[in-house]
Amino acid sequence: MSSKYPRSVRRCLPLWALTLEAALILLFYFFTHYDASLEDQKGLVASYQVGQDLTVMAAIGLGFLTSSFRRHSWSSVAFNLFMLALGVQWAILLDGFLSQFPSGKVVITLFSIRLATMSALSVLISVDAVLGKVNLAQLVVMVLVEVTALGNLRMVISNIFNTDYHMNMMHIYVFAAYFGLSVAWCLPKPLPEGTEDKDQTATIPSLSAMLGALFLWMFWPSFNSALLRSPIERKNAVFNTYYAVAVSVVTAISGSSLAHPQGKISKTYVHSAVLAGGVAVGTSCHLIPSPWLAMVLGLVAGLISVGGAKYLPGCCNRVLGIPHSSIMGYNFSLLGLLGEIIYIVLLVLDTVGAGNGMIGFQVLLSIGELSLAIVIALMSGLLTGLLLNLKIWKAPHEAKYFDDQVFWKFPHLAVGF
């Protein structure tokens, strides 16, 4: 089996990626500058740490979480890094153009980088549904479309519904999940005979996927609190996320054992379910007033995640062609919805408590926001899927799905590395 790209892709990818990079450099040259204000250096370092946490989540956490395929682990990690690097650049520009540009140049601050990393994270969540079935040239398209769609969604929600950065970014879970699933739906599905083994997980890659899950687990509180406005809100968000993910780990491991006839624990269930609590409390992490509530949500999220991992893969594999171990898409779609529903329930409780019809209006607005996020995710995902099906991208043949050797140079050209 040749380890080379097809000739057409060898011409297409470097040209496409480097032209795009040159265009980005020009855009940065003409339209951006750094925030030059004097600032306390200690404060600067503290502020940078949040951005660093997000980068670790994206590069190591999501990079390794998606690396559990027997013969697609290299590509998963490296392609994730490639998409993150590209996505952050485009997200900084896009966010600047959408929010600051009328005033002149786009000012780049640590906050812009934080925001851009979170936008790029959306792509890394979505891509789990299609990794192994697309090449880098296609992934570049996916990054550009998804970051643009998410940026515009956030801008629309901010303008129409007047929500702050935290609230409109927390739609990322639902948006990324539905975007990824709709892209996957458009791609060729059936794995031809003889390639089924490639989408199976292996021990060493599964261990690296667990490492990814651990990094995500450790830094999820930073993700949920990164865009909040005051220290009180951030502190509350960090605590609640921590309690929720702690409980979802216990639930995931015990629930996984419970779901197996012999009481065995499934690696795949655990990889995703440990994060369940963090996703479920995302939208309302700063609003939950006490640990026990966050813990209950973590428990419910863990159970839903394990239940989803047990019953949904069959359906997703059949309908969307998503392999059994790529469960982030449907996991996040369920848990993201749970998170949004929790927030809406809080508003409903307010309505009941206050007897104020106007809070009911707030409930409608929140449902409107969620619906808009799902609709834009599905539409832009379908558009991306259709674009990725174009012949010009020279997509890997179905027989070469989930195969590192299609993309990487291995000196020994071993088949079963």
Epitope: E39, G43, A46, S47, S230, P231, G353, Q362
Partner: antibody, heavy 129, light 109 residues
Framework: QVQLVESGGGVVQPGRSLRLSCAAS????????MHWVRQAPGKGLEWVAV????????YYADSVKGRFTISRDNSKNTLYLQMNTLRDDDTAVYYC??????????????????????WGQGTTVTVSS | EIVLTQSPGTLSLSPGERVTLSCRPS???????LAWYQLRPGQAPKLLIY???SRATGIPDRFSGVGSPTDFTLTISRLEPEDFAMYYC??????????FGQGTRLDIK
Amino acid sequence: QVQLVESGGGVVQPGRSLRLSCAASGFTFSSYGMHWVRQAPGKGLEWVAVIWYDGSNKYYADSVKGRFTISRDNSKNTLYLQMNTLRDDDTAVYYCAREGTLYSSSWYRRYYYYGMDAWGQGTTVTVSS
Amino acid sequence: EIVLTQSPGTLSLSPGERVTLSCRPSRYIASDYLAWYQLRPGQAPKLLIYGASSRATGIPDRFSGVGSPTDFTLTISRLEPEDFAMYYCHYSGGSPPYPFGQGTRLDIK
């Protein structure tokens, strides 16, 4: 007690620059967002800019975007407003204000409220040729 | 961008009277982020009400605020001589900019 003292105001020609400072004391400066607000002669209050408690995020009114820069030095408990390309309509009394975050809780939810709960006495900026 | 419209522009009343000032946003806003300020000549502004209805520390109970997301009011139940001043509503939620209303002037009759 909480004290905010603005300085740096004065008379300046159009197109020139000025830097306002606001020295804070009596509270943990690094835990609060800070605002600049101005009042032009005979006009109402106009919000100018805000900076988050850690300095990571800044927002500006459309009328000053691209010309004014808000910053803070938490080690010196000081807030700044760098004003470039000043115009006649920037003539005003400039106040710095602390953004208080207050909250209350029910059994199921915490509510956050924001209000500028401490203000300086203001510093006057006159832009005139 | 949200615009806050205050009405009336000016009111002339006597001490002891009750007054209600209105603040209307151009579109829906969350009441958690609406505040009222008092500005007396030559003094710094003072926070009266936050979260549309909660009195700030040290503010007498004759000041009260209520509001739905489309209409907010500040009520002073019995006017005292020191209450004659400018009153501004301000919104600081969602996405900036954070606008002030144009103000209501309360004059002594």
